[in-house]
Interface confidence: low
């Protein structure tokens, strides 16, 4: 990895050992400032691999909204508006990090954790096994 | 949202004023141990909306490399291989939360920062505008 | 490590019945459905039927529609297949699944299968 200096004005760490506990502001900062947040919004029914968004929430979690993408076909939808299923609807998923309240039901204490989403569904070519 | 009681063993905090400031343990928990994390490893090359992963790397932010997805083609691929500019490859784009050193070169303390990323792309009907 | 337990086989005479259990354990949150699957000797694995957790939504493969009757137990994250006027055809080794995209998920999104209960009609 990247060395970095230490900046001489940090908050000091009395907790040296791992696992390692560090301060985390919570006041969100959006990068997201030039984007148009519906620009992508109907691709979910546009999709030749449409799907629907499912409501994942958990108040022990931050955030505790998270939508699941799930498709809506085994196939894929032809020209003609027909599923072909001659071709697969399959998920793209990412590992995203959330906060976990720990111990559960604390304000201010949290532990990363990673887990996997679905975030919306592509169309691919079945991989076909051979039997000999 | 839903009101959950405060348990009494939480670590105390001092700072009660926004921006709100909270204790992370860093020791990642990694919630995906039943997926198989090749499962969709090969979807950017056979989708009919194939995609390129480029590396963004970032000292500063938590975690520091995150993969972007970059669509290799404006149309789509069709059953002959060819790409069809009557479809269009689109980014499937998701808002996740990072961790941003602040201030700068700070191993103990961070800020949450949201950030759009390109997880993959998927194969969408195009709209089309019709001229009066 | 998500564990699958099915049991309830057996052999029966054709226009018999059967119910078949399928015991889930170590099913991530993010688990939708479960689904039935079959292999006859010399046949690819197929769908027999799904059922949502969350809606109990149910859905069959044509050659079962009528007969077969899917059905859940969501406290002991159990799930059933009653098989009716079962026909030989339906010989086969049954397998249960997750099914963590829907009621339409491909097989071969699975990375774990148990050992099934086999199931024999005679004529």
């Known amino acids: 990895g990247i060395t970095i200096p230490r900046n001489p004005g940090c908050p000091n760490s009395e907790d040296k050992n791992f696992p390692r506990t560090v301060m985390v502001n919570l006041n969100i900062h959006n990068r997201n400032t030039n984007t148009n947040p519906k620009r992508s919004s109907d691709y979910y029914n546009r999709s030749t691999s449409p799907w629907n968004l499912h409501r994942n929430e958990d108040p022990e979690r931050y955030p505790s909204v998270i939508w699941e993408a799930k498709c809506r076909h085994l196939g894929c939808i032809n020209a003609d508006g027909n599923v072909d299923y001659h071709m697969n609807s399959v998920p793209i998923q990412q590992e995203i990090l959330v906060l976990r309240r720990e111990p559960p039901h604390c304000p201010n204490s949290f532990r990363l954790e990673k887990i996997l989403v679905s975030v919306g569904c592509t169309c691919v070519t079945p991989i076909v096994h051979h039997v000999a | 949202g839903i009101t959950i009681p405060r348990n009494p063993g939480c670590p105390n905090s001092e700072d009660k004023n926004f921006p709100r400031t909270v204790m992370v343990n860093l020791n990642i928990h990694n919630r995906n141990t039943n997926t198989n994390p090749k499962r969709s490893s090969d979807y950017y090359n056979r989708s009919t909306s194939p995609w390129n992963l480029h590396r963004n790397e970032d000292p500063e932010r938590y975690p520091s490399v995150i993969w972007e997805a970059k669509c290799r083609h404006l149309g789509c691929i069709n059953a002959d291989g060819n790409v069809d500019y009557h479809m269009n490859s689109v980014p499937i784009q998701q808002e996740i939360l990072v961790l941003r050193r602040e201030p700068p070169h700070c191993p103990n303390s961070f800020r949450l920062e949201k950030i759009l990323v390109s997880v993959g792309c998927t194969c969408v009907t195009p709209i089309v505008h019709h001229v009066a | 490590q998500v564990q699958l337990v099915e049991s309830g086989g057996g052999l029966v005479q054709a226009g018999g019945s059967l119910r078949l259990s399928c015991a889930a354990s170590?099913?991530?949150?993010?688990?939708?459905?479960m689904g039935w699957f079959r292999q006859a000797p010399g046949k690819e694995r197929e769908f027999v039927a799904a059922i949502s957790w969350i809606s109990g939504g149910t859905k069959y493969a044509d050659s079962v529609k009528g007969r077969f009757t899917m059905s859940r137990d969501n406290a002991k994250k159990q799930v059933y297949l009653e098989m009716n006027s079962l026909k030989p055809e339906d010989t086969a080794v049954y397998y249960c699944?997750?099914?963590?995209?829907?009621?339409?998920?491909?097989?071969?999104?699975?990375?774990?299968w148990g050992q099934g209960t086999q199931v024999t009609v005679s004529s």
């Open positions: 170590g099913l991530t949150a993010s688990s939708y459905a």
């Open positions: 699944n997750d099914m963590p995209y829907g009621l339409d998920t491909r097989m071969d999104e699975y990375a774990y």
